[in-house]
């Protein structure tokens, strides 16, 4: 049995009431594809959220989050409180991160500093709240006599290919 | 309320030609099909042609090549301009709001009342 309603352009529902007529989508509504037996009720971006996109008839409207906030979840379904770099959200609010951590967005937890000596190099730089270390050459390579300075390349006759 | 007005239909000569016309009202007319249907004395209703929304269009094999269906979505009128005409297409000719913006095995919501065609030298 074929759909009679399947022809329906989005924008407009296939309307029961009126002996299956296509119909538009009332106001405050949408339908995002064709053959809708109804339209759904446009997502309202209130609080926390801000408007990004105006609901149309053929899409639902998207929602952002105010100053201060940034966005969870599949199509921003949630707004999640800003910290500060440094910081991250606890269920007490924005708490500091602990010595050996670091955040460096207003967003997401602490992370803790990268290991250099894991990898066999020193800390060129140390670690803050906001920054991770920055790792340097291996002590080995720092140690006297040891050259880190690379050779010059040997100079090449004019019109002379390499070997 | 759904209301359909058909007008343009008269005697004619065969070989002739007639432009029928269909004023609609009462509903979204651009985003739905339309149709014309016929009755000959004694005969059941049958499809002659459709329209859908995005103006592709569907033809009875009886009048391919010589009846064209059209619209006209600012003026809410959906038109069969009809030629070559035959004996056999005299009918009362109807107009017919389409279920679902369908040509293709079409269903009628609403019929308009009908506009006499007649062909006869």
């Known amino acids: 049995l074929q759909d009679l309603c399947s022809n329906c352009p989005a924008g407009t529902f296939c309307d029961n009431n009126r002996s299956q007529i296509c119909s538009p989508c009332p106001p405050n509504s949408f339908s995002s594809a064709g053959g809708q037996r109804t339209c759904d009720i446009c997502r309202q971006c209130k609080g926390v959220f801000k408007t990004r996109k105006e609901c149309s008839s053929t899409s639902n409207a998207e929602c952002d989050c105010i100053s201060g906030y940034h966005c969870l979840g599949a199509e921003c379904s949630m707004c999640e409180q800003d910290c500060k770099q440094g910081q991250e959200l606890t269920k007490k609010g924005c708490k500091d991160c602990c010595f050996g951590t670091f955040n460096d967005q207003k967003r997401g937890i602490c992370r803790p500093w990268t290991n250099c000596s894991l990898d066999g190099k020193s800390v060129l730089v140390n670690g803050t709240k906001e920054r991770d270390v920055v790792c340097g050459p291996s002590p080995a390579d720092l140690s006297p006599g040891a050259s880190s300075a690379t050779p010059p390349a040997p100079a090449r006759e004019p019109g002379h290919s390499p070997q | 309320e759904v209301q359909l007005l058909e007008s343009g239909g008269g005697e004619v000569q065969p070989g002739g030609s007639l432009r029928l016309s269909c004023a609609a009202s009462?509903?979204?007319?651009?985003?739905?099909?339309m149709g014309w249907y016929r009755q000959a004395p004694g005969k059941r209703r049958e499809f002659v042609a459709a329209?859908?929304?995005?103006?592709?269009?569907v033809y009875a094999e009886s009048v391919k090549g010589r009846f064209t269906i059209s619209r006209d979505n600012a003026k809410n009128t959906v038109y069969l301009q009809m030629s070559s005409l035959r004996a056999e297409d005299t009918a009362v000719y109807y107009c017919?709001?389409?279920?679902?913006?369908?040509?293709?095995?079409?269903?009628?919501?609403?019929w308009g009342q009908g506009t006499l065609v007649t062909v006869k030298p």
């Open positions: 017919g709001l389409l279920k679902g913006n369908r040509v293709v095995s079409p269903s009628v919501a609403y």
């Open positions: 329209i859908e929304s995005g103006r592709n269009t």
């Open positions: 009462g509903f979204s007319f651009s985003i739905n099909a």
